[in-house]
């Protein structure tokens, strides 16, 4: 058993039929010694009586919020969660597995540049009594300070016959330096808490492996004299690291026609302009990565031909 | 370049921006075998890392390029050495299409550049390497890779800002 | 081509030292580490140790330890194998071969200790 | 070090006939095991590596199988010049050890 927060513990459960489970001794925080009864949840029900309380925890039932009284007044209050382990593994029920980029990758991240600031994201299918607590830090044995948000709910879908919950949180390295080359991992862990079940995830990875740009801005066409060619030009994102001669992109600019099996013409350059031919009812889209190291790409940003 | 001399800016934007292609383009083919993480070992004592305090940052090398020059240089040695060494040179052979051979020698072409015959920086950080087990190469073949790509990429963008901003 | 070619037999006396060379063409000599296999006559394979001519670094079966000296000249792409205080258990066939996992062999030197 | 040991010592067969040679490692060594064979009078020729991958200019009647401990050498229809001594040989870690041999005969 450990303590997750004030008056919050975790019991930690070896789940299989007919488990021993764990016994657990609480202690009611008052300096009074006698006349103490003990009640779980809103049953008046007396389990118990004295300063501590020994009981087996060994299933849902047993969790709880247990609460120490005298002569009618509330003393104290602790509430006990399970973090259920089978067959060695600890229990991934509370998050969806997003399988990309691989198996069993519940929490994904993404950063729109080097300075530090990144966002990750992870989804359910369950809609109340959820709680969610996320730390952080660069690296394990000596951490370096990473300041995490309030996780909040981003978006809703429907998925089939059921519906899907993301949600997300901002975190930002307390002292990001863009430039450096990073050594030790970001570490986030998530702390997940649904009705009486405590899980916990965890993700590692460096700034430079979750680096996604923003698209290219103000993507534009300009049509070159008696040719087919148009000249495409764009601009760095806005979110981009600067200065840019030291935070490179490279694009890739595409010329797509309107049914998507037609042959889609590809162009990679380290410029923000390119020549292309312009085929009617075509659309041309641009998109950017870093330049020297090969993290994703860009979403694309698009314009017409026409 | 040791003495406060300027590397030759643009030679050196140019190999260091084929070194990034080639840490990427030799990642997937480092052996015949599938790789299997057979345990965790570190890839090597110290790899040297461009750090914050290492004046790589454009403020750092506006100020002085030599420390940042002198870092990179170390760890293009150090590269350029295990990349050498058994780990690669030795079973399970490299596929035949694998680039790692033209990546050594351009690891030791930009180093050169850095450090003309007969211009000395002080003492270079040498990989302690215990001689690796055959079934241990793939994972630190893996590892060393990674690492390198995320050093050129650091190395990469120096060069490009120097030879935007300080060639002269 | 990849091909790998080694010096001629050698009569040498008991207690006297004998230095073989495996010349090596095809290929970057630095590219590769070189091995030493044992073979005595009419009996099975045995592994010498290797030498990686990039640094010279050597890998030796302990059993070889103090007998075999491995060495290479990068500029002549020549390995060597240098076996000292000689006795009649040494008579045998010494094959090089680059990297272990690949068809390279040399033909094999014969060596014949004898008074 | 690895053990490595050989069975048959001996096979005698009749061209055509499916063979399997048989090689088992002291220790697991995954799939780190090569196959060689040696006709009289020659260097050794490598015909399987990493357990089951061919070699180029190798016959398709030989293939390899196994893991671990456990590796076969099939040869799927065996020709009068499949004679020799067949080593098998732990690729897997230091001191790197063959298998004493096993020596196809026709018949």
């Known amino acids: 058993i450990w303590e997750l927060k004030k008056d919050v513990y975790v019991v930690e459960l070896d789940w299989y039929p007919d488990a021993p489970g764990e016994m657990v001794v609480l202690t009611c925080d008052t300096p009074e010694e006698d006349g103490i009864t003990w009640t779980l949840d809103q049953s008046s029900e007396v389990l118990g009586s004295g300063k501590t309380l020994t009981i087996q925890v060994k299933e849902f039932g047993d969790a709880g919020q247990y609460t120490c009284h005298k002569g009618g007044e509330v003393l104290s209050h602790s509430l006990l969660l399970l973090h259920k382990k089978e067959d060695g593994i600890w229990s991934t029920d509370i998050l969806k597995d997003q399988k990309e980029p691989k198996n069993k990758t519940f929490l994904r991240c993404e950063a729109k540049n080097y300075s530090g600031r990144f966002t990750c994201w992870w989804l359910t299918t369950i809609s109340t009594d959820l709680t969610f607590s996320v730390k952080s830090s660069r690296g394990s044995s000596d951490p370096q300070g990473v300041t995490c948000g309030a996780a909040t709910l981003s978006a809703e879908r429907v998925r089939g016959d059921n519906k899907e919950y993301e949600y997300s949180v901002e975190c930002q390295e307390d002292s990001a330096c863009p430039a450096a080359e990073e050594s030790l991992p970001i570490e986030v862990m998530v702390d997940a808490v649904h009705k009486l079940k405590y899980e916990n995830y965890t993700s590692s990875f460096f700034i430079r492996d979750i680096i996604k740009p923003d698209p290219p801005k103000n993507l534009q066409l300009k049509p070159l004299k008696n040719s087919r060619q148009v000249e495409v030009s764009w601009e760095y994102p806005d979110t981009w690291s600067t200065p840019h001669s030291y935070f490179s992109l490279t694009f890739c600019v595409q010329v797509q026609g309107k049914s998507k099996r037609e042959k889609k013409d590809r162009v990679f350059t380290d410029k923000t302009s390119a020549t292309v031919i312009c085929r009617k009812n075509a659309s041309i889209s641009v998109r950017a990565q870093d330049r020297y190291y090969s993290s994703s790409w860009s979403e694309w940003a698009s314009v017409p031909c026409s | 370049v040791p003495g406060g001399s300027s590397p030759a800016w643009t030679q050196c934007q140019q190999l260091s921006q084929k070194l990034c292609t080639l840490a990427w383009s030799a990642h997937p083919l480092v052996g015949h075998m599938d790789l299997r993480e057979e345990g965790d070992e570190e890839t090597t004592n110290d790899v040297p890392h461009i750090q914050c305090g290492d004046g790589c940052d454009p403020q750092g090398l506006r100020d002085n390029s030599q420390f940042c020059l002198q870092r990179i240089h170390q760890g293009l040695i150090f590269y350029e050495k295990l990349l050498g060494s058994d780990i690669f040179t030795g079973e399970p052979s490299l596929l035949p299409d694998s680039p790692v051979g033209q990546l050594h020698a351009s690891l030791l072409g930009l180093s050169q550049l850095l450090q003309p015959e007969g211009h000395h920086w002080e003492t270079q950080q040498i990989p302690s390497l215990s001689p690796s087990q055959p079934w241990q190469r793939l994972l630190l073949r893996f590892k060393i890779l990674r690492s390198l790509q995320a050093f050129v990429a650091v190395a990469a963008r120096v060069f490009a800002h120097g030879a935007a901003t300080l060639s002269p | 081509e990849v091909q790998l070619q080694q010096s001629g037999p050698e009569l040498v006396k008991p207690g006297a030292s004998v230095k073989m060379s495996c010349k090596a063409s095809?290929?970057?000599?630095?590219?590769?580490?070189m091995h030493w296999v044992k073979q005595k006559a009419g009996q099975g394979l045995e592994w010498i140790g290797y030498i990686n001519p990039y640094n010279d670094g050597t890998q030796y079966n302990e059993k070889f330890k103090g007998k075999a000296t491995l060495t290479s000249d990068k500029f002549s792409s020549t390995a060597y194998m240098e076996l000292s205080s000689l006795t009649s258990e040494d008579s045998a066939v010494y094959y090089c071969?680059?990297?272990?996992?690949?068809?390279?062999w040399g033909q094999g030197t014969l060596v014949t200790v004898s008074a | 070090d690895i053990v490595m040991t050989q069975s048959p010592a001996t096979l005698s067969v009749t061209p055509g006939d499916r063979v399997s040679l048989s090689c088992r490692a002291s220790q697991s060594i995954s799939e780190y095991l090569h196959w060689y064979q040696q006709k009289s009078h020659e260097s050794p020729r490598l015909l399987i590596k990493?357990?089951?991958q061919s070699i180029s200019g190798i016959p398709s009647r030989f293939s390899g199988s196994g893991s671990g401990s456990d590796f076969t050498l099939s040869i799927n229809s065996v020709e009068p010049e499949d004679v020799g001594v067949y080593y098998c040989q732990n690729g897997h870690s230091f001191p790197f050890t063959f298998g004493s041999g096993t020596k196809l005969e026709i018949k």
């Open positions: 990493y357990a089951s």
């Open positions: 095809g290929y970057t000599f630095t590219s590769s580490v």
């Open positions: 071969t680059r990297r272990l996992d690949e068809a390279y």
